[in-house]
């Protein structure tokens, strides 16, 4: 347990001290305090180095000090032979004697109590960002006004996060632009606008003076933009390095304005607004859209008709036409939708008479009805040639869709008659 | 036939035999029968083949054969109490609707009908072929198709001819232009047995094809002179019969 | 008179083949597109492959495609149908039919059995 | 896939009486490809109407057929008792697999 004081002894003290003794003594006193640790009496065995008998404080992995011989205190008022003053809460103490001692030696006395310590000044590593406020026990930190203090509870910044703009059309500025920007901030903004809609950001080169990036190509102080899983930037530098119009193709963004501690500019202006998300015109083979325009966005139906001969086979329903709306995604709905050639299936069967397979069934695709010869002929005209329509049907240039008619010719013998002579 | 040759089948593909009565008839289309109205009108379910020569029993089971349907006799045929006494053969025409179509091939196929035409007008010595299976100079019945070429006549040569068996006086017999007479060359006539069979003529628009230009109906003694109703003057009536009579799949 | 037998029909294992045969005659067998439809105990009628007359275009209900194919041999005047992978749910009297004017089937065989089952 | 219902599944008539058949259909078809076949019990089923109102060979004259778009009627004048089967619609669309109607009982009430 962390103790605001305490004594150390060393073995048999005031008597001799005996031979081959290691001990040490874990000093913790609470967080936010230093120790100092002070000898009122010291006799050990002298030695170069202290290498055969010594004292040792130990201050984590740093050896503050190693004590041998004899000392005496050089202020009459005051009893203290040697002492030590640590920033830290913890010490430790290390007694070692060797295996002989040529005289009687009695050892040490020392003592140890809780002090304050400054943490404002104490430590090359300034805690505070801003103000560093002591106090015995400790410090806290603090902020000018306009900015405050981060979780880390030493850091401050501008309190310019959590601002949602959901407007089809707005502005957005760094803090106190064109005054200059306050250090060690984060700044967080969010445009969240109705789907469908894209944003698309518009800035001016001189609306835009962000501390420069380092040797590395690193920027200190970066503005960065996030569209799902899209970023945009970082961004740093005097004058906009980027896109003067960034489409993000999402309704969603987010703004990261980050700054370091040093090397404040003016910072930056940025105008927004909600663009209706575009669909690419598809290249959709053997079909015509109505209405045809050069650019398509959210919202936007299109009737997709295929061309004659062609045809959509939804489930295996064939339709001539569908529609196809540009959604919020910048996709269109019904995409997987094709018009393919149209197939009239197999011919149908006629009496008395044939047709060929044909090598195809589809559009455009000729076929033969014939009727069996020479005993049935075609009645109803038209050739017997029918071609795969557009609608569907196999279809004949005099006929249309009817079929031939195979009907028996007449008043043929097929072998004449001869009267036989008696 | 009386004084005809041994004919084919493929010669007459339209040939029909009808076995009760002993007659015959025209395959007119897939679907039609044209006969005398005397040979159907005491039967109206006859059964009838087609495709074979010989009407032996043994031939005939392997011909086609075919089912009627329906009858349709000529209106204007006058049926009698006694048709054995039957003096007035006008009208002498009927059809038979089959239940099934005929396949056709070589030994089956059917004969035209005239036109309307005045082109199948027949003149006096125009040459018309009949077949069948009646009566020969041998034999009662023919087993083997029979057929013969005779020329057309004019009426008179018929009225002329003294009936063998009348059943009336020789004044009863009704003779109309609705009749074709032919015949008186070399015996050749047609007999009992081949009526309702076709007198088939050449078409004049067509040499290559036959037209049922009559049907053997009657005559006043076999060898001589028959009378054949003239089918040209029933086209009409034919056309009618089978369109209101026929099926989509006909039409 | 237009005639159609069917054979090949019986017992048969789940994931089995059959091999379906139907003899045509009476008519011109090549000049007409030819069907299998089947009929399960005591359900409907369920068409199931279309050959057209030549042979070159072949159509299937979804669930035999791949599976079934239908073929004909018009020297032999034959229909056939190659069952493979059989399932239980193939179990039904198999006919053939010939194809008419608007696809009607206009003549039909008397079936032949098919029984898929362990 | 386009679905035939026929309706009723079962119809209860007595010989001489009227009956009417209904095929209906889940989208349009065509009237040339709407047919209809008679089967008895332990028979292949026959051709009875085809293209929507033709009669098969055969059939008598007091079966009729009519309809058009997707709904399609098969009638019998007066019932026969030969007439007593069941009845099938079916359809050809070439897009689609042919399809048969689940069929309607005629029965004798």
């Known amino acids: 347990e962390p103790t605001m004081y305490g004594e150390i002894l060393s073995p048999n003290y005031p008597q001799a001290y005996p031979s081959e003794v290691e001990k040490s003594w874990d000093i913790e006193v609470p967080e936010g305090y230093g120790i100092h640790l002070y000898f009122t009496h010291l006799d050990i065995e002298l030695s170069e180095n202290c290498a055969y008998d010594s004292v040792q404080i130990i201050s984590g992995d740093t050896e503050e000090g190693r004590l041998c011989g004899q000392r005496s205190s050089n202020n009459p008022h005051s009893p203290i032979v040697e002492e030590f003053q640590v920033p830290y809460n913890k010490l430790q103490v290390i007694f070692k004697s060797d295996f002989s001692n040529e005289e009687r030696f009695t050892g040490f006395a020392a003592y140890y109590v809780a002090t304050d310590i400054n943490e404002c000044t104490d430590f090359v590593d300034v805690p505070c960002s801003h103000f560093c406020n002591n106090f015995i026990g400790g410090y806290f930190c603090s902020c000018p006004p306009e900015y405050f203090l981060h979780d880390d509870m030493k850091n401050c910044g501008v309190n310019c996060s959590g601002d949602v703009f959901t407007a089809l059309i707005g502005e957005i500025a760094s803090p106190n632009y064109p005054k200059p920007y306050p250090e060690n901030s984060r700044c967080e903004y969010q445009i969240r606008l109705e789907k469908g809609f894209q944003v698309v950001v518009t800035l001016r080169r001189e609306d835009f003076d962000v501390e420069a990036a380092d040797s590395a190509g690193n920027c200190l102080d970066s503005l960065v933009f996030v569209a799902g899983d899209r970023q945009f930037g970082p961004y740093c530098g005097h004058g906009f390095p980027g896109p003067l119009n960034i489409e993000t193709k999402s309704n969603a963004l987010d703004i990261i304005f980050q700054t370091d501690l040093t090397g404040q500019k003016k910072g930056w202006k940025l105008r927004y607004h909600g663009d209706p998300m575009p669909c690419p015109k598809e290249d959709t083979p053997n079909s015509v859209w109505e209405p045809a325009k050069a650019k398509y966005v959210f919202r936007d139906v299109v009737q997709i008709t295929c061309l004659d001969g062609f045809e959509v086979v939804e489930g295996r329903v064939g339709a001539t036409s569908f529609y196809s709306t540009c959604q919020s995604n910048g996709k269109w709905s019904n995409s997987k939708l094709k018009c393919q050639p149209v197939d009239c299936g197999i011919p149908e069967s006629i009496e008395n008479g044939k047709v060929e397979d044909p090598e195809s069934t589809l559009f455009g695709s000729v076929i033969r009805y014939t009727c069996e010869e020479p005993y049935y002929y075609m009645e109803n005209g038209g050739g017997g040639e029918y071609h795969c329509a557009g609608n569907g049907s196999w279809v004949n240039e005099v006929l249309g869709p009817e079929l031939p008619k195979c009907v028996p010719v007449c008043g043929v013998p097929r072998e004449p008659f001869e009267e036989k002579q008696r | 036939i009386i004084g005809g040759s041994d004919a084919d089948i493929k010669n007459f593909p339209w040939q029909v035999f009808f076995d009760n009565p002993w007659a015959g008839g025209a395959l007119i289309n897939e679907y039609w029968v044209l006969t005398a109205a005397h040979v159907v009108e005491g039967n109206r379910e006859p059964t009838m083949y087609v495709g074979s020569t010989s009407v032996q029993t043994s031939r005939l089971a392997k011909s086609k054969m075919l089912t009627p349907e329906h009858v349709f006799i000529h209106p204007g045929w006058k049926l009698l109490e006694v048709p054995e006494g039957r003096t007035n053969f006008d009208n002498d025409i009927a059809l038979v609707r089959l239940k099934d179509p005929v396949k056709m091939g070589p030994t089956v196929s059917p004969i035209c009908l005239p036109g309307t035409s005045s082109d199948y007008n027949l003149m006096d010595g125009d040459l018309g072929l009949i077949s069948g299976w009646g009566r020969t100079e041998k034999r009662d019945r023919a087993v083997r198709l029979k057929a013969a070429r005779l020329p057309v006549a004019p009426l008179r040569k018929c009225k002329e001819v003294k009936v063998e068996k009348p059943t009336a006086d020789a004044e009863a017999y009704v003779f109309t232009p609705n009749m074709i007479c032919a015949g008186g060359e070399k015996g050749m006539d047609s007999c009992k047995g081949d009526s309702g069979g076709a007198f088939a003529v050449q078409d004049p628009n067509d040499k290559t094809k036959f037209y049922a230009a009559g049907l053997v109906s009657w005559g006043p003694q076999c060898g001589t002179y028959g009378l054949y109703t003239r089918v040209k003057n029933y086209v009409d009536w034919i056309m009618k019969t089978m369109q209101e009579n026929s099926t989509p799949r006909e039409d | 008179e237009v005639m159609l037998v069917e054979s090949g029909g019986g017992l048969v294992k789940p994931g089995g083949s059959l091999r379906l045969s139907c003899a045509a005659s009476?008519?011109?067998?090549?000049?007409?597109?030819m069907s299998w439809v089947r009929q399960a105990p005591g359900k409907g009628l369920e068409w199931v492959a279309t050959?057209?007359?030549?042979?070159?275009?072949?159509y299937y209900l979804d669930s035999v495609k791949h599976r079934f194919t239908i073929s004909r041999d018009n020297s032999k005047d034959t229909l056939y149908l190659q069952m493979n992978s059989l399932r239980a749910e193939d179990t039904a009297l198999y006919y053939c039919?010939?194809?008419?004017?608007?696809?009607?089937?206009?003549?039909w065989g008397q079936g032949t059995l098919v029984t898929v089952s362990s | 896939q386009i679905v035939l219902t026929q309706s009723p599944a079962t119809l209860s008539l007595s010989p001489g009486e009227r009956a009417t058949l209904s095929c209906t259909a889940s989208s349009s078809v065509s009237s040339s490809y709407l047919h209809w076949y008679q089967q008895k019990p332990g028979k292949a089923p026959k051709l009875w109407i085809y293209?929507?109102?033709n009669l098969a060979s055969g059939v008598p004259s007091r079966f009729s057929g009519s309809g058009s778009g997707t709904d399609y009627t098969l009638t019998i004048s007066s019932l026969q008792p030969e007439d007593f089967a069941t009845y099938y619609c079916?359809?050809?669309?070439?897009?689609?697999?042919?399809?048969f109607g689940q069929g309607t009982k005629l029965e004798i009430k």
């Open positions: 079916h359809q050809y669309y070439r897009l689609h697999p042919i399809t």
């Open positions: 009476g008519f011109t067998f090549s000049n007409y597109a």
């Open positions: 050959i057209s007359s030549g042979g070159s275009h072949t």
């Open positions: 039919a010939r194809l008419f004017t608007g696809h009607a089937m206009d003549y």
């Open positions: 293209s929507t109102s």
